[in-house]
């Protein structure tokens, strides 16, 4: 059920999940100098049913030096709404998956969390791509990738997006980099089923992406 590989890499593009399918896990990791509280959670889990899903567990970090200080931030509903709005500013914004049944929205930050987030995506997860600042999109199809299960193996579909520099002339079809088919890698190249994957993101903001839907940069 969990996806094995990272979503495909597109040159000069980043991807973002608008919402996370039930079953998705997020590691509770702390930044240098901090550690999980005693008996703290190892990960958060998007749990629930088709009508309502939410993140189970809270990630809590405490100073490695001070044993008893614990700090954890859980935004109030208003703050969550505000954060969500910030993520939804792009004119190319896809459907708000956070309102879809069986999905969780981006988990709120916790104090002293690690600079990288590790997600474990599940089959059916969709991620959206957008060109980084200074590059524009040449679309040949959906700028998204979905984790699918075929013949007992997980794979990500290939997003149909090319990012070209603002000053560059558009590439002619014959000059385009070869792209995998929308259905992803050929079956012969698809690795055997693995049931878990951790995905890394950096929680540091990208410099200035005025129309960006991304509050986090995925690697």
């Amino acid at each position: 059920e969990l996806c094995d590989d990272d979503p495909p890499e597109i040159p000069h593009a980043t991807f973002k999940a608008m919402a996370y399918k039930e079953g998705t896990m997020l590691n509770c990791e702390c930044k240098r100098g901090f550690r999980r509280i005693k008996s703290g959670s190892l990960y958060m889990l998007c749990t629930g049913n088709s009508s309502h899903s939410s993140w189970d567990n809270q990630c809590q970090c405490t100073s490695s030096a001070t044993r008893n200080t614990t700090k954890q931030v859980t935004p109030q509903p208003e703050e969550q709404k505000e954060r969500k709005t910030t993520e939804m500013q792009s004119p190319m914004q896809p459907v708000d998956q956070a309102s879809l049944p069986g999905h969780c929205r981006e988990p709120p930050p916790w104090e002293n969390e690690a600079t990288e987030r590790i997600y474990h995506f599940v089959v059916g997860q969709m991620v959206y791509y957008q060109c980084v600042q200074g590059y524009r999109a040449l679309h040949r199809g959906p700028a998204e990738s979905v984790c699918k299960m075929t013949h007992g193996k997980t794979r990500w579909t290939q997003p149909q997006l090319i990012c070209t520099g603002e000053m560059e002339t558009s590439q002619f079809p014959g000059e385009e980099k070869p792209q995998a088919s929308p259905e992803g890698r050929p079956e012969s190249e698809t690795s055997c089923l693995v049931t878990t994957t951790d995905f890394q993101i950096q929680t540091e903001m990208a410099a200035t992406m005025e129309t960006s839907i991304f509050t986090t940069e995925y690697q």
């Epitope: 590989d5 889990l45 990288e116 690795s191 693995v194 951790d198 890394q200």
Partner: antibody
Amino acid sequence: QVQLQQPAAELARPGASVKMSCKASGYTFTTSTMHWVKQRPGQGLEWIGYINPRSGYTEYNQKFKDKTTLTADKSSSTAYMQLSSLTSEDSAVYYCARHYYFDYWGQGTTVTVSS
Amino acid sequence: DIQMTQSTSSLSASLGDRVTISCRASQDIRNYLNWYQQKPDGTVKLLIYYTSRLHSGVPSRFSGSGSGTDYSLTISNLEQEDIATYFCQQGNTLPPTSGGGTKLEIK
């Protein structure tokens, strides 16, 4: 096919250190956390700690914090666990296991501490 | 730390039997319960995670249930290859802890 390969056995003297390996194949090493588990004969499984190979982030069971050092070499897709100041209590089978669910396990390394 | 107790350390059953192995946690573990099978040669495999989710490749005769502090693993139709020791483990509260194991034998 996911595989975690561990040496079958390691022999060490009391007071010495031992460093055992766990070579991963069949998946991208940096996309999953690697955990280490201790099992004494006829006993249960004791979680030692884990490492996130991508970032080097580690988390230890307090019981093993001063005894154990976890590292990972991305270039060879290998995780390592070093045990220091060995005593007879450290004689056990040590397993590496992938991900929080421990979905795939190595065959285990039997560590014997003996003079 | 959370204590996990498997009150039955060994269990005898006949091939074809329905076998249930129980596990109790010292506090509510909110379904973060995994089951592992350890063969006599030491090989360990994940069977069930998050109380009832069957790991890939595990036969459907294995199932898990429970909530709060009490959990169980059921083998609906015991086969020779199921002879092993079964461990429960709470998998989300630091540190993860396991029961002492239940050794399953053939009558």
